[in-house]
């Protein structure tokens, strides 16, 4: 896997350990927590990033509260099981043998059960909404300029193909970015919208995952775009399965 040869680091993932022990003395980087080799020319999967995050100290866990509506990611931190490709395993369990099914972005999509719970397949999250509220500004941003800047950001910083940014909506102070990527649309080598959304979320929170890069400095026509609230919603290709008891709680 490629990495910066001179100092052997991973530009796209600072939560790695790198050493020149690859073929021909090439730099090879492994994700913290899992020890899996990562491709430093693209984004690392969210599963491996969460695992790395949980391997670091002082991590508090909060719960994702599911519902019959679009799933909301409330930064539900847990130590996930990842498959050999770095994707979330469909079934996740904790140390007390409580298990649940997740979607491709790792958000719970069923009631919790025991070890007998079956999750037949990893259900793909094909539509993501990033809902932002920006801090007060002298005036509203120009919608076209804002749209262009956010599309540029996802293309250049996160390497997400422009066709996967479905829409950018703006009604001051709310910005909504829609990412859409069906299974059939995603070609080999394409960045996953779930990974791009996770990198963006961490950037917005001032917790950039990129190695050595400055934090995210979002500007629209020179005017800083400062985000004060972020919510991320997920729609799966197959609706989640929660009991009616859970839905009315």
């Amino acid at each position: 896997h490629t990495a910066a040869q001179d100092n052997c680091t991973c530009p796209t993932n600072k939560m790695t350990v790198c050493s020149p022990d690859g073929p021909g003395g090439r730099c090879q980087c492994r994700a913290l927590g899992s020890g899996m080799a990562v491709d430093c020319s693209t984004l690392t999967s969210k599963c491996l990033l969460l695992k790395a995050r949980m391997s670091a100290p002082k991590n508090a866990r909060t719960l994702v509260r599911p519902s019959e509506h679009a799933l909301v990611d409330n930064d539900g931190l847990y130590d996930p099981d990842c498959d050999p490709e770095g994707r979330f395993k469909a079934r996740q369990c904790n140390q007390t043998s409580v298990c649940w099914c997740v979607n491709s972005v790792g958000v719970r999509r069923t009631d919790k059960g025991d070890l007998s719970l079956r999750c037949d397949e990893l259900v793909r999250t094909h539509h993501i909404l990033i809902d932002l509220r920006h801090r007060p500004t002298a005036g509203a941003f120009n919608h076209s300029d804002l749209d262009a800047e956010l599309r540029r950001l996802f293309r250049e910083r996160y390497r997400l193909h422009p066709k996967f940014v479905a829409a950018v909506h703006y009604e001051q102070p709310t910005i909504q970015i829609e990412l859409r990527q069906n299974t059939s649309q995603k070609a080999a080598g394409d960045v996953d919208i779930g990974d791009a959304a996770y990198y963006f979320e961490r950037d917005i929170k001032g917790e950039s995952l990129f190695q050595g890069r400055g934090g995210l400095d979002l500007r629209v026509r020179g005017e800083p775009l400062q985000v004060e609230r972020t919510l991320i919603y997920y729609l799966d290709e197959i609706p989640p399965k929660f009991s009616m008891k859970r839905l009315t709680a």
Partner: nanobody, 117 residues
């Protein structure tokens, strides 16, 4: 600019049918729970039907079995099919869009439905 535009209202005889439409723009429609409310003169606004992002529906007891709501995410439109209409269904029908957790709550202007012989 966020917009919800209802259409399809009108005058219909008891026992007749109408199909209301609500065209949405300016927001991420697919993620929003959509609802139909109605308000009769001198009365409060009541929920008629709701449909979640995944298409799960819920109805007021007074319209169960007669009204059906559906959505077309490709067209950013939600529908209310109203059958076996009664005079007491006369009201202004208003479309609502709600994004749970985000406090985004948008309303249309409404369309008048009058059931009378």
């Amino acid at each position: 600019q966020v917009q919800l535009q209802e259409s399809g209202g009108g005058l219909v005889q008891p026992g007749g049918s109408l199909r209301l439409s609500c065209a949405a723009s300016g927001f991420a429609f697919s993620f929003y729970a959509m609802a139909w409310y109605r308000q009769a003169p001198g009365k409060q606004r009541d929920m008629v039907a709701t449909i979640t992002a995944y298409g799960n529906t819920n109805y007021a007891d007074s319209v169960k079995g007669r009204f059906t709501t559906s959505r077309d995410n490709a067209k950013n439109t939600v529908y209310l099919q109203m059958n076996s209409l009664k005079p007491e269904d006369t009201a202004v029908y208003v479309c609502n869009a709600n994004l749970p957790s985000a406090s985004h709550n948008y309303w249309g202007q409404g369309t008048q439905v009058t059931v009378s012989s």
